[in-house]
Interface confidence: low
Amino acid sequence: TTPEPCELDDEDFRCVCNFSEPQPDWSEAFQCVSAVEVEIHAGGLNLEPFLKRVDADADPRQYADTVKALRVRRLTVGAAQVPAQLLVGALRVLAYSRLKELTLEDLKITGTMPPLPLEATGLALSSLRLRNVSWATGRSWLAELQQWLKPGLKVLSIAQAHSPAFSCEQVRAFPALTSLDLSDNPGLGERGLMAALCPHKFPAIQNLALRNTGMETPTGVCAALAAAGVQPHSLDLSHNSLRATVNPSAPRCMWSSALNSLNLSFAGLEQVPKGLPAKLRVLDLSCNRLNRAPQPDELPEVDNLTLDGNPFLVPGTALPHEGSMNSGVVPAC
């Protein structure tokens, strides 16, 4: 017997569907109507045939009352080839729901997204996470998707993007966006970052994550942020292979005074990089290759400095973080 594709937990909180059959019974997903957190994985299926069975242009207001009754707040859709028209139809219906967080992963979006009809209402998401999503429309995908969202988006995460640079002239500002995560785009690089950080389109960013994005120096990142007018409070540059030295011909970059937390862990650093902000609340240099204790004049003024897992403290050992239990367990670097 084949296992049930959908499983709802005992608290009716989380429902996970794995549709791996060539002709899945999509009606099985109805058991998820009572769940707050829903995950639907489509096993790599092409959802093109769906367009024949649904009227993507139908007025979604006819479903408004039903959709409003759904408890779903977090929805993950993964592993499918989705026509843009179908995605738009789903977004139009979900606009009447109480959905707050949407994650799309391992999707191939085919075709172009039509513009938002005048009478249509956007989806009031607080968080949108995309991982390994490809769009037929290339660089204009964010602008096309953005018009289907209300302007209150607070968290945007884009990982393994096929086109992490955006068509900036088409993108509208994200006035409420406080967290932007472009991590796990190893081909991005500092020039790509400049292209992705559309100037003045991210005025409210407080947290910027750039883990594993091909960044080379903190100074190069500083220049990209300055060019875009982005002034994060917290910047994560961990898991990049960073150079400690600055190109002498490169102009000095003044970090924004708003920046108070900088993560440079797992960056392969053999010394504290030059060109750091003069003052920080938090600096994480853990799991690097520092062979000696940094001298005070090499460091910014910092209230909380983490140096766990560097060779000068002894190879392979680490120290507890502030607030962590000193259990003797060594975090692996």
Partner: nanobody, 118 residues
Framework: QVQLQESGGGSVQPGGSLRLSCSRS????????MGWYRRAPGEQRELVAS???????TYADSVKGRFTISRDNTMNTVYLQMNNLKIEDTDVYYC????????????WGRGTQVTVSS
């Protein structure tokens, strides 16, 4: 939050030895110095010995050649090996962590009594 806990104090005859230990919990910063101070009743605390994260040591003139400060590799524990103890070494010994970051901060243990008498 940093916490320091001393152990190893006690009574010993002149010429004897004691080993004090100070266990630290909380983070270690590159600019930290850990040390031992002592204070007799009514006196100011005076530095006995200190050690930095990088391993640099400092001693009071009165204990040079008799006392040795050391640490484990993670600086979770700092030791003070006291040899050839003298009656004038009798004091309460306090573990100290000095952190020079944006501002200089001192953290103290509660102290351990060392008594040298014949």
């Amino acid at each position: 939050q940093v916490q320091l806990q001393e152990s190893g104090g006690g009574s010993v005859q002149p010429g004897g030895s004691l080993r004090l230990s100070c266990s630290r919990s909380g983070p270690i910063y590159s600019v930290d110095t850990m040390g031992w101070y002592r204070r007799a009743p009514g006196e100011q605390r005076e530095l006995v010995a200190s050690i930095t994260v990088g391993g640099t040591t400092t001693y009071a003139d009165s204990v040079k050649g008799r006392f040795t400060i050391s640490r484990d590799n993670t600086m979770n524990t700092v030791y003070l090996q006291m040899n050839n103890l003298k009656i004038e070494d009798t004091d309460v010994y306090y573990c100290n962590l000095n952190r020079r970051l944006a501002k200089s901060e001192d953290y103290w243990g509660r102290g351990t009594q060392v008594t040298v008498s014949s």
